[in-house]
Interface confidence: low
């Protein structure tokens, strides 16, 4: 349905407070260093734009696609060429070039300051003062920070974030009620970043098919009752709702993902049982209920795959009339099935499905060629199901933070070239899969598990593309999307490093690491550890362990004395001295 | 939108025939392999018969194997069931279903089987 003024269209679908918030986040997310003020001051104007289209479509400009408006606005800032370099490029281009231009400048780790939470009292004065601002303040520098932050669920969590405010400035006790909120919203909020950003770098890196594989395995598990068609159809919305979003149309990407989720209630009948609390909630809390609904139960009498997808002689007809929708069919069966796998196992198991139809209807019995075909899933099966029983079982036994470290070192001695920050804040992430997935029953560990693995992996890659130092990475993350977890598994010792010079300043220690948090503390040793194994790759974990036991001792013992500061730099001394002595540095 | 819907429906004696017909739209119907599932009274829906994307290959349930016949007309997008020798125990309401599936995505059409 073409309409003469798009952004008139987007502005009253949307309304005038959605459309100012998603604006704000989608020029954040392309001038991460902006300052606010500025970034307030272009949206008022593009919004008051808006309102003249509005009242008459026919007004000049308004007929303008929304990255030409969009951009032209950013390419009004004045210090684009001192802020930010080659990126001032962008705007000698024409659309769509100048959008992707701006798209491949989005940096997923900024140099911007760590965002430091101040004292409740003086944030519940700045709430009062200026609720707009203070919540416009929230969108910035999350989206400045998130560049690929999904934008319309920001707009939930600015919706969570105001009420919490809300209830907590007027508590007796405002601490105790605002702060483990504020916690929950920040892990929240950066589990959601990571989830998004995978779904970006599918789309960008692996295309379109890749990740609508990956929407028809996750949503037949989801909804295994619905028609394949029914998710066909779902997996074609949902599709383009993300591509919207990742390629930074914000305002039809939430306009698009609030009609998907009415479709979805309109005809949750014929989707899934699951849905009725969800869509009896406003827009925001439904879409984001329904994005994360529990799977639906499992029709009682599914035949066997095998008859539709081994044992039928139209195998190769029906593969060859329509190979992605026959592929499709097939995912979709598998995955309805198996709420138990992972989806990139399901994933896995469909390429292979395909590599053998491939190969065997052009054999000359294709039936004969391909009969054992679901024979070659059970080592698929397999692997992920042993790694996970013996990593959970290494984290029952250490416990999170000694279960990281195991981690760290085992990263550390696979990719040492990455920079200590990056193998630090991705092997911390992987060690939450433990907390995370481990106290889940065996039907519920390997979903769990290995699709938060893969969401954090991501992370590693989009930080390593960045700056790239690493070819095993490199590779690990470019060959196959499904497969980057097991290839980073299979990755041994890197015998090609040549182990880091010793530098006493990376183990000095100060009296400020007492006053830090126990998770600010625990990223300091970790650091240490890290670069440790840098040092030493070859040291053994009982080496390693007896060097952070004697580290722990000495932060303890330095924390208590009087004299923190002399403490920290005569024991530091004999605490370096002694390390390099056990690891034969 | 998908949409899925069945005709045909009726009230027949022991020994009967009926014709159910399933109009299908908003996808390609030529690509899929269809099916038909019933659901009796207080009971969990039952497979009854499946037809490639084709029509070639054809499945049937135990229970109304001989009986029952499956088709296709994929320029009119329609999917049939030819019911002969109707037993009190084929009544249910028949829906018809993309693939091989037992789910419903559609109203559906009541048989009713009695003397």
């Known amino acids: 349905d073409a309409h003469k003024s798009e952004v008139a269209h987007r502005f009253k679908d949307l309304g005038e407070e959605n459309f100012k918030a998603l604006v704000l986040i989608a020029f954040a997310q392309y001038l991460q260093q902006c300052p606010f003020e500025d970034h307030v001051k272009l949206v008022n104007e593009v919004t008051e734009f808006a309102k003249t289209c509005v009242a008459d479509e026919s007004a000049e400009n308004c007929d303008k696609s929304l990255h030409t408006l969009f951009g032209d606005k950013l390419c009004t800032v004045a210090t684009l060429r001192e802020t930010y370099g080659e990126m001032a490029d962008c705007c000698a281009k024409q659309e769509p070039e100048r959008n992707e231009c701006f798209l491949q400048h989005k940096d997923d780790n900024p140099n911007l300051p760590r965002l430091v939470r101040p004292e409740v009292d003086v944030m519940c004065t700045a709430f009062h003062d200026n609720e707009e601002t203070f919540l416009k303040k929230y969108l910035y520098e999350i989206a400045r920070r998130h560049p690929y932050f999904y934008a319309p669920e920001l707009l939930f969590f600015a919706k969570r974030y105001k009420a919490a405010f809300t209830e907590c400035c007027q508590a007796a006790d405002k601490a105790a009620c605002l702060l483990p909120k504020l916690d929950e919203l920040r892990d929240e909020g950066k589990a959601s970043s990571a989830k998004q950003r995978l779904k970006c770098a599918s789309l960008q890196k692996f295309g379109e098919r890749a990740f609508k594989a990956w929407a028809v395995a996750r949503l037949s598990q989801r909804f295994p009752k619905a028609e394949f068609a029914e998710v066909s159809k779902l997996v074609t919305d949902l599709t383009k709702v993300h591509t919207e979003c990742c390629h930074g149309d914000l305002l039809e990407c939430a306009d698009d993902r609030a009609d998907l989720a009415k479709y979805i209630c309109e005809n949750q009948d014929s989707i899934s049982s699951k849905l009725k609390e969800c869509c009896e909630k406003p827009l925001l809390e439904k879409s984001h209920c329904i994005a994360e609904v529990e799977n639906d139960e499992m029709p009682a009498d599914l035949p066997s795959l095998a008859a539709d997808f081994v044992e039928s002689k139209d195998v190769c007809k029906n593969y060859a009339e329509a190979k992605d929708v026959f592929l499709g069919m097939f995912l979709y069966e598998y995955a309805r099935r198996h709420p138990d796998y992972s989806v990139v196992l399901l994933l896995r198991l469909a390429k292979t499905y395909e590599t053998t139809l491939e190969k065997c209807c052009a054999a000359a019995d294709p039936h004969e060629c391909y009969a054992k075909v679901f024979d070659e899933f059970k080592p698929l099966v397999e692997e992920p199901q042993n790694l996970i029983k013996q990593n959970c079982e290494l984290f029952e036994q250490l416990g999170e933070y000694k279960f990281q470290n195991a981690l760290l070192v085992r990263y550390t001695k696979k990719v040492p070239q990455v920079s200590t920050p990056t193998l630090v804040e991705v092997s911390r992430n992987l060690g939450k899969v433990g907390s995370k997935c481990c106290k889940h029953p065996e039907a519920k560990r390997m979903p769990c598990a290995e699709d938060y693995l893969s969401v954090v992996l991501n992370q590693l890659c989009v930080l390593h593309e960045k700056t790239p130092v690493s070819d095993r990475v490199t590779k690990c993350c470019t060959e196959s999307l499904v497969n980057r977890r097991p290839c980073f598994s299979a990755l041994e010792v890197d015998e090609t490093y040549v182990p880091k010079e010793f530098n006493a300043e990376t183990f000095t220690f100060h009296a400020d690491i007492c006053t830090l948090s126990e998770k600010e503390r625990q990223i300091k040793k970790q650091t240490a550890l890290v670069e440790l194994v840098k040092h030493k790759p070859k040291a053994t974990k009982e080496q390693l362990k007896a060097v952070m036991d004697d580290f722990a001792a000495f932060v303890e013992k330095c924390c208590k004395a009087d004299d923190k500061e002399t403490c920290f730099a005569e024991e530091g001394k004999k605490l370096v001295a002694a390390s390099q002595a056990a690891l034969g540095l | 939108q998908v949409q899925l819907q069945e005709s045909g429906g009726g009230l027949v004696q022991p020994g009967g025939s009926l014709r159910l017909s399933c109009a299908a739209s908003g996808f390609t119907f030529g690509s899929f392999g269809m099916s038909w599932v019933r659901q009796a009274p207080g009971k969990g829906p039952e497979w009854v018969s499946a037809?490639?994307?084709?029509?070639?290959?054809?499945r049937y349930a135990e229970s109304v194997k001989g009986r029952f016949t499956i088709s296709r007309d994929n320029a009119k997008s329609t999917l049939y069931l030819q019911m002969n020798s109707l037993k009190p125990e084929d009544t249910a309401v028949y829906y018809c279903?993309?693939?091989?599936?037992?789910?419903?995505g559609s109203q559906g059409t009541q048989v009713t089987v009695s003397s």
């Open positions: 037809i490639d994307s084709g029509g070639a290959d054809t």
């Open positions: 279903t993309i693939g091989r599936s037992s789910s419903r």
